[in-house]
């Protein structure tokens, strides 16, 4: 069995990716420069560490989390890295053009790299729903469209609703989930006879997926606190996220056992549910006043995640063609919504407590923001899905879904592995 790309893709991918990279280099040459201010070097290192945490989350965490397929683990990890590298470059430029360009050149700071990494993370969440069914050329398109859509969404929310960096980036969970699900909906769904085994998980890839989940679990407090303006807010965010993810781990493992007739623990449930608390607490992590509230949220999120993992895959597989182990999309869509609802509840409680009519108005604004995020995610996701269906990309044939050998050179293998 040949492990080569089809000839047309072999021409298309390098040309498409390298032309794009050359264009990005030119844009960086003409439109960007580094922040010239002389900063305290210790402060610089501390600031960089936050960005480093985010990169670890993206490259190792999400990279390995999506690697549980028996025959698609190499592609999952490497394609994630490829998308991250491309996404960060485009996100830096896009954020700069949207926010600072009128003043001249785009100034690149550690903060802009931090923002860009988080924007690129959105693609890595979304792509879980389509990995294995698309090639790298299609993923490049997905990166460009999604980063652009998210950048514009954040800009619109910032300008219309006057939301700060943290609040408008926390729509990433809902945005990424709905974007990924709508792209998946557009792609060819039925798996032909004889390929069902490829979307099953295997022990070693499942272990690496668990490793990814562990990295995400460790660094989720950094993600939720990265864009907050003051140390007090960051401290609260770190503590609350930590308590929430700690409880969601306990809930995930025990809930998974509870959901199984023989009391066995499902790897797939655990991979995803351990992160549940971090997603659910994200929007309001800096506002939650005491640990027990964050812990209750972690508990609820863990239960929702396990429940979703038990009952939703059948529906998602039929309607969207998403394999059972790719549960990040609907998991994040439910938990992201939970997180947004919790924030709205906090606003409502504030209204009741203070009798302040303006906060009632803020509730409406928050609902508007959430609705806008979902609408833009669905629309841009559908657009991406339609683009990915174009013949020009030479998408892998359905029989080649979830197969590393289509993309990678394995000298020691003639067939299967």
């Amino acid at each position: 069995m040949s492990s080569k790309y089809p000839r047309s893709v072999r021409r298309c991918l390098p040309l498409w990716a390298l032309t794009l990279e050359a264009a990005l280099i030119l844009l960086f040459y003409f439109f960007t420069h580094y922040d010239a201010s002389l900063e305290d070097q210790k402060g610089l290192v501390a600031s960089y560490q936050v960005g480093q945490d985010l990169t670890v989350m993206a490259a190792i965490g999400l990279g390995f989390l999506t690697s549980s397929f028996r025959r698609h683990s190499w592609s999952s990890v490497a394609f994630n890295l490829f998308m991250l590298a491309l996404g960060v470059q485009w996100a830096i430029l896009l954020d700069g053009f949207l926010s600072q360009f009128p003043s001249g050149k785009v100034v690149i700071t550690l903060f802009s790299i931090r923002l860009a990494t988080m924007s690129a993370l959105s693609v890595l969440i979304s792509v879980d729903a389509v990995l294995g069914k698309v090639n790298l050329a299609q993923l490049v398109v997905m990166v460009l469209v999604e980063v652009t859509a998210l950048g514009n969404l954040r800009m619109v929310i910032s300008n219309i609703f006057n939301t700060d960096y943290h609040m408008n980036m926390m729509h990433i969970y809902v945005f990424a989930a709905y974007f990924g699900l709508s792209v998946a909906w557009c792609l060819p769904k039925p798996l032909p006879e004889g390929t069902e085994d490829k979307d099953q998980t295997a022990t070693i890839p499942s272990l690496s997926a668990m490793l990814g989940a562990l990295f995400l679990w460790m660094f989720w407090p950094s993600f939720n606190s990265a864009l907050l303006r003051s140390p007090i807010e960051r401290k609260n965010a770190v503590f609350n996220t930590y308590y929430a993810v700690a409880v969601s781990v306990v809930t995930a493992i025990s809930g998974s056992s509870l959901a199984h007739p023989q009391g066995k623990i499902s790897k797939t449930y655990v991979h995803s549910a351990v992160l549940a608390g971090g997603v659910a607490v994200g929007t309001s992590c800096h506002l939650i006043p005491s640990p027990w509230l964050a812990m209750v949220l972690g508990l609820v999120a863990g239960l929702i995640s396990v429940g979703g993992a038990k009952y939703l895959p059948g529906c998602c597989n039929r309607v969207l063609g998403i394999p059972h182990s790719s549960i990040m999309g609907y998991n994040f869509s439910l938990l992201g919504l939970l997180g947004e609802i919790i924030y709205i509840v906090l606003l409502v409680l504030d209204t009741v407590g203070a009798g302040n009519g303006m906060i009632g108005f803020q509730v409406l604004l928050s609902i508007g923001e959430l609705s806008l995020a979902i609408v833009i995610a669905l629309m841009s996701g559908l657009l991406t899905g339609l683009l990915l269906n174009l013949k020009i990309w030479k998408a892998p044939h359905e029989a080649k879904y979830f197969d590393d050998q289509v993309f990678w050179k394995f000298p020691h293998l003639a067939v299967g592995f």
Partner: antibody, heavy 126, light 106 residues
């Protein structure tokens, strides 16, 4: 005692540069965002620039963008304002101010400049 | 958001109740602060978040309002209160100040 003290002001010709410094004492400087605010003679207050507590994010008023740079050295408890291409209308008393974050209720942080330095005078004249 | 204070100056006597208003060009929720500045001195924070009194500030100072209309009230004017008062919004960049209201002795 919580204190901010500006220095570096003086008389300078248009087009030249000046660097203001603000020394902080009596509080954990690295835990606070910092602002520069100016006041032209006989006029009101005008916000100039702001930096986050860790220096990772900065904001400027449109009239100084590309000419002024705010920075901080948390190891020296010092805030800086590098002013290039100075113009006559940059003449003012420059204050540095500390930003306090306050949670009121349970759904919003509010920000205000709670500690100010005495100011340093910058005169741009030919 | 642009801030417009009124009046630009007022004369009052010790013991008077004084009200200064500040209007924003767009809704700024409760992101409004009030400062007092005496001649040759740095400004001093009085009220933050439209109505919360900064610690150490006498209770005769109070703030109210949300959205676009805000008020600073001095319930009983004292000799040390004769100064210029500024409102400032922290809702969106650029942070802006009102043009100031000078409270003078009648």
């Amino acid at each position: 005692e919580v204190q901010l003290l500006e220095s570096g002001g003086g008389v300078v010709q248009p087009g030249r540069s000046l660097r203001l410094a603000c020394a902080a004492s009596g509080f954990s400087f690295r835990s606070y965002g910092m602002h520069w605010v100016r006041q032209a003679p006989g006029r009101g207050l005008e916000w100039v620039a702001f930096t986050w507590f860790d220096g990772s994010n900065k904001y400027y008023v449109d009239s100084v963008k590309g000419r002024f740079t705010i920075s901080r050295d948390n190891s020296k408890n010092t805030l800086y304002l590098e002013m290039n291409s100075l113009r006559v209308d940059d003449t003012a008393v420059y204050y540095c101010a500390r930003e306090a974050s306050m949670l009121r209720g349970i759904s919003r942080y509010y920000y205000a400049m709670d500690v100010w330095g005495p100011g340093t005078t910058v005169t741009v004249s030919s | 958001a642009e801030l417009t204070q009124s009046p630009s100056s007022l004369s009052a006597s010790v013991g008077d109740r004084v009200t200064v208003t500040c209007r924003a060009s767009q809704s700024i929720s409760s992101y409004l602060n009030w400062y007092q500045q005496k001649p040759g001195k740095a400004p001093k924070l009085l009220i933050y978040a439209a109505s919360s009194l900064q610690s150490g500030v006498p209770s005769r100072f109070s703030g109210s309002g949300s959205g676009t209309d805000f008020t600073l009230t001095i319930s009983s004017l004292q000799p040390e209160d004769f100064a210029t008062y500024y409102c400032q919004q922290s809702y969106s960049t650029p942070w802006t100040f009102g043009q100031g209201t000078k409270v003078e002795i009648k």
